[in-house]
């Protein structure tokens, strides 16, 4: 049974007499008058067991200790440590010829853990073992005590274990404490990757070449190795682990990052706070959670904030111009946190009667300098149709516009486009002849722009060739041309008045009048 | 066992000597020295001095010198303690007592019985 | 010389209870003091020696201190057959003993 002393965590103790509870029991030769195992009380009045030898009498001693077996648990080179104290020759009276102030430490290799005699030959001399100038003081009792420590090394081992001895040769001399330790490089994680115990090599230069494991949560960057000197020191790390996303080093441990941090990639780079409108609720997390109403576009790097689409462009002027609207707005009062805000505008014609009714204006409506993705706060909307109520809607938006399931990002006007002069009556029709008169229908023009405030009609006798015409006007779609010539050739134009001026007259329509009482009734444009 | 065996008690008229011997057993006996401590009647001990047994050597305490010799004979294991020209005031028990070096101090860790000498005319 | 003086002269004692002697050298003897046990018609018996270790044999209720000029010999529990004389003795410069001191029974 040993008790616990604290040694270098790069030493692992393989015997340590100050921690054998009760006798060492250790075989001495001769059995008698050489070697005595001795209790003293250390500082703490607690018992060391001790071996001492004092025979400085008589000439040519040899006195033999041999430890019991010590295992060799796989080192190759293991060092003993020995605390002894020596009395010098000149303390002790009568002894001059016959004192030494030196012993022996030997030692011999064996696979039997049971050997009962000190074969002398068998055993191997490691070094005579002299008392330094320099001693340490320790008390003993109450009694300063002159300490010695002395260490040496053997190897290589190769047998399951080993067996020291002591060979006094006449000094006067006490084994305090004799411990047998290997070295290792211990247990280290060094760049995130763990190096196991390793027992240092069988040479006292030699270097042993051990390759690290990445420790939890961690993956390799270049291959971790090391070398464990012969001292028990790590040496030269090469190559290194980066904790995996979601994790970083802390106290040479790749620990999750906590709430409220993330990391993206495998990295030596910590944890990074959630950027702005941005959580995370779990440990571990490899990116953030965008808040409610905030979004993450594709190409949008996990450290960048979560933004929103924008809101609504702000001050919407448009400026009419008979067919064409110019329309101007300012940039809207939140971006939503991005630089990549642009504009598309929605064209609605829509009936003047309901204003809801509203249809897509169609590709004939021409946008400058474009309809979508619009990068300045204006457009010139042209080739509109007069006199018509049209919704226009500048929407606002950006990289996340399209995640918002509830938009609320655009502004409207509604216009009405001037009225413009109308478009040519396309069908006139002689509705009733006779002798002396003409009765005309026809259409409202196509395109009327505006309100038509009266048809006017021009007529002349196809002789004349236009050079002596009436004019007649009505508001209404349909009048009787009277006092005309029977049997007469006649060419009839028809045009529509807006506010805005005449249109274009129709296609002649030529009629003739009859010679006998009765009517004719047509509705081709020329009628005979 | 280890012991030490000294003579019975012995009565000398002054001016006389005697020689107490001090028999050792049960252990090397060159390898320890030997001691010599007297005890009058009624007083405290009084070392004598001692006598390597290796080289025969001795070392006489003060007051103990001249009439008092210390003497060996190895090939028996005993050592002698000589006092001649004897006065009353030797009047003691001489004790011989093995002395035991160590590397913690020394000590007289076996003794003889003692050998009382009296010196009455 | 080195004159030890041992205090006191006579210590009475019960049995069971604690017996502390003292030895006081004339001039430091470093560690180099012995404590000796003497009952009557017997010789001196070894207890201590270099001022602390107890000699082989000798029951663990005795222990000693000190070192240079004071010592101390402590009989934690004093048993019938403690009651004797002890004697220190130096083996710094040659060797002398104390006086004694005789503990008796209370």
């Known amino acids: 049974v040993t008790g616990s002393r604290v040694y270098p965590a790069n030493e692992v103790t393989l015997l340590d007499s100050r921690s054998v509870q009760g006798e060492l029991g250790w075989i001495a030769s001769p059995l008698e008058g050489g070697w005595e195992e001795v209790s003293i009380m250390d500082e703490k009045n607690t018992p060391i067991r001790t071996y001492q030898v004092c025979n400085v009498m008589e000439p040519s001693q040899n006195n033999w200790l041999r430890t019991d077996w010590i295992t060799r648990e796989g080192a190759q080179r293991v060092y003993i440590e020995i605390k002894f104290t020596l009395r010098d020759c000149n303390s002790l009276p009568g002894v001059m010829g016959t004192c030494k102030e030196t012993f022996n430490l030997y030692y011999y290799e064996s696979d039997n853990d049971k050997e009962r005699f000190i074969r002398e030959n068998q055993f191997v001399k490691i070094d005579t073992i002299a008392a330094d100038e320099s001693f340490t003081q320790v008390d003993i009792g109450d009694r300063i005590m002159k300490l010695n420590t002395e260490i040496r090394d053997v190897g290589p081992l190769s047998k399951k274990g080993f067996y020291l001895a002591f060979q006094d040769v006449g000094a006067c001399i006490a084994l305090v404490s004799v411990r047998v330790f290997y070295k290792k490089c211990p247990l280290t994680v060094r760049n995130l990757a763990q190096f196991p115990d390793t027992i240092t090599g069988a040479d006292t230069s030699s270097l042993v070449e051990v390759r690290g494991s990445c420790v939890n949560n961690s993956e390799e960057k270049d291959v971790p190795k090391m070398y464990c000197g012969a001292d028990g020191e790590w040496l030269v790390p090469i190559g290194n682990c980066l904790c995996n996303a979601g994790h970083e080093e802390r106290s040479g441990e790749c620990q999750a990052c906590k709430i409220g941090y993330y990391k993206a990639l495998s990295t030596d780079a910590t944890c990074a706070k959630c950027p702005p409108h941005s959580y995370s609720v779990w440990e571990g997390a490899t990116s953030c959670t965008c808040d409610r109403g905030f979004f993450r576009a594709d190409n949008d790097a996990a450290s960048m904030p979560c933004t929103r689409p924008p809101s609504a462009p702000l001050n919407l002027i448009s400026n009419v111009n008979e067919t064409s609207v110019n329309l101007e707005w300012s940039s809207p009062q939140n971006t939503g946190g991005r630089q990549d805000i642009s504009y598309n505008v929605v064209c609605k014609k829509c009936g003047a009667g309901d204003p809801s009714k509203c249809r897509p204006c169609g590709s004939g409506v021409h946008y400058t300098p474009q309809q979508n993705g619009l990068k300045t706060t204006k457009v010139s909307i042209t080739d509109l149709l007069a006199h018509t109520n049209y919704t226009f809607e500048i929407w606002a938006v950006n990289g996340v516009s399209k995640y918002n399931p509830n938009p609320d990002q655009s502004v409207s006007v509604t216009v009405t486009t001037n009225q413009a002069a109308p478009s040519s009556i396309a069908l006139v029709q002689a509705k009733e002849v006779t002798r002396y008169s003409v009765a005309l229908a026809w259409l409202e023009p196509d395109r009327p722009n505006g309100v038509i405030l009266e048809y006017e009609v021009k007529y002349y006798e196809k002789d004349q060739n236009e050079r002596s015409y009436r004019i007649v006007r009505t508001a209404a779609r349909n009048t009787d041309i009277k006092g005309l010539n029977p049997l007469t050739s006649y060419v009839f134009h028809v045009r529509a008045r807006t506010a805005a001026g005449y249109g274009d007259f129709s296609e002649p329509l030529e009629v003739t009048t009859n010679t006998v009482p009765s009517r004719i009734i047509g509705d081709g444009a020329n009628s005979t | 066992q280890v012991q030490l065996l000294q003579s019975g008690a012995e009565v000398k008229k002054p001016g006389a000597s005697v020689k107490v011997p001090c028999k050792a057993s049960?252990?090397?006996?060159?390898?320890?020295?030997m001691s010599w401590v007297r005890q009058a009647p009624g007083q405290g001990l009084e070392w004598m001095g001692w006598?390597?047994?290796?080289?025969?050597?001795?070392t006489y305490a003060q007051g103990f010198t001249g009439r008092f010799v210390f003497s060996l004979d190895t090939s028996v294991s005993t050592a002698y303690l000589q006092i001649s020209s004897l006065k009353a005031e030797d009047t003691a028990v001489y004790y011989c007592?093995?002395?035991?070096?160590?590397?913690?101090?020394?000590?007289?860790?076996?003794w003889g019985q003692g050998t009382l000498v009296t010196v009455s005319s | 010389e080195i004159v030890l003086t041992q205090s006191p002269a006579t210590l009475s004692v019960s049995p069971g209870e604690r017996a502390t002697l003292s030895c006081r050298a004339s001039?430091?003897?470093?560690?180099?003091l012995a404590w000796y046990q003497q009952k009557p018609g017997q010789a001196p018996r070894l207890l201590i020696y270099?001022?602390?270790t107890r000699a082989t044999g000798i029951p663990d209720r005795f222990s000693a201190s000190g070192s240079g000029t004071d010592f101390t010999l402590t009989i934690s529990r004093v048993e019938p057959e403690d009651f004797a004389v002890y004697y220190c003795?130096?083996?710094?410069?040659?060797?002398?003993f104390g006086q004694g001191t005789k503990v008796e029974i209370k």
């Open positions: 049960g252990y090397t006996f060159t390898s320890y020295a």
């Open positions: 270099g001022a602390s």
């Open positions: 001039q430091s003897v470093s560690s180099n």
């Open positions: 003795q130096q083996y710094g410069s040659s060797w002398t």
């Open positions: 007592a093995r002395v035991r070096f160590t590397v913690y101090g020394d000590g007289m860790d076996v």
């Open positions: 006598i390597n047994t290796n080289t025969g050597n001795p």
